[in-house]
């Protein structure tokens, strides 16, 4: 069969809240994916599993089930939200994210996503990894692709 193409488009929005006592940051990060079915038959997007890493530590996970059916030669844009928590050994970030003297509090997060598609009961998995800038200092909505962090360490897609 032809491929199912999964393209991670970027962060759509990041909504932030804080726990002052625990010096904890809560970031709800909504991401956008484009999934294209290059086959001549419909496929089902069975689930999307996502995780977010900060400084090689997993700070959030999410899973969406029974998402949609994508027709042949069709593309669907799917948004998914990953709730993340920056706390404990990373509580030093609280000071950075709440610092009033700077305007933009960008941190680099690694977004990992795996899409599972099925056709007649057979599954196929496609994974993507992307580094993205997210502002941990305020609620932000992004133009798609605006949050991309280009780094020599980032694998070429």
């Amino acid at each position: 069969p032809r491929s199912i193409d999964v393209k991670y488009i970027g962060v759509k929005s990041a909504y932030v809240s804080y726990d002052v006592q625990k010096r904890t940051i809560y970031l709800n990060i909504t991401n956008t994916l484009n999934i294209t079915n290059n086959n001549y038959y419909s496929v089902e997007v069975e689930n999307i599993t996502a995780q977010v890493q900060f400084s090689k530590t997993v700070i959030g996970k999410a899973r969406l089930n029974n998402i949609t059916i994508i027709g042949p030669l069709d593309m669907k844009q799917i948004d998914y939200t990953v709730p993340t928590v920056i706390a404990e050994e990373m509580s030093y970030m609280y000071d950075f994210c709440t610092l009033i003297s700077i305007k933009v509090h960008n941190i680099v997060l690694m977004m990992q996503v795996t899409v599972t598609t099925t056709y007649f009961g057979h599954s196929e998995q496609i994974s993507q990894e992307r580094y993205q800038y997210v502002d941990c200092g305020r609620n932000t909505t992004y133009q798609l692709g605006q949050s991309e962090y280009l780094n020599v360490l980032q694998p070429q897609q």
């Epitope: 001549y40 027709g71 030669l73």
Partner: antibody
Framework: QVQLQQSGAELVRPGTSVRVSCKAS????????IEWIKQRPGQGLEWIGV????????DYSEKFKGKARLTADKSSSTAYMQLSSLTSDDSAVYFC?????????????WGQGTTVTVSS | DVVVTQTPLSLPVSFGDQVSISCRSS???????????LSWYLHTPGQSPQLLIF???NRFSGVPDRFSGSGSGTDFTLKISTIKPEDLGVYYC?????????FGGGTKLEMK
Amino acid sequence: QVQLQQSGAELVRPGTSVRVSCKASGYAFTNYLIEWIKQRPGQGLEWIGVINPGSGITDYSEKFKGKARLTADKSSSTAYMQLSSLTSDDSAVYFCTRSPFITTVVADYWGQGTTVTVSS
Amino acid sequence: DVVVTQTPLSLPVSFGDQVSISCRSSQSLANTYGNTYLSWYLHTPGQSPQLLIFGISNRFSGVPDRFSGSGSGTDFTLKISTIKPEDLGVYYCLQGTHPPRTFGGGTKLEMK
């Protein structure tokens, strides 16, 4: 009932372009692929390409890339095939056909065919 | 592209005969999910081709049961059990598993 009504015969000059239409009725236009097939006089059937009318995404046989361009208008349930830089090799009957998204059915209903004659 | 070879090229028949047409592909037409997109069509003069068989052996609606399809992998057969006048024309097989779709060269069923 399902119908694919194609535009009438065309007599065109070499080097010009022609657009063939295929109007669908009797079914949900965006739930089926539209495919195009060529038949030259005395020859067999040749697959040109396919379009998903809902998304507008197309795929072509290598041979027809740059020759054929497939489009679809959802509002009128009509698919189009434009053929460019016409030569005598493009003189043929062109059929449109539909294929459902699900099941192994391919090309279950066909248009009546449009004859394109390229001549100076 | 997958090459589809049909034999014979021409088949002289008499009404009431039983005939078989063969279709061979250059690679297996079973996709990784086990589905095989192999169809048979009849093209009669002055008409559009009509679907007879899809998915190797499934008769399309309204197709008489004298038409049957069989095969697997790379070898497929269309059988017509009792030839009638309306069965005369050119028969084509089509593989739809591997893009681009490709037709066999056709088999002309004609009177002896």
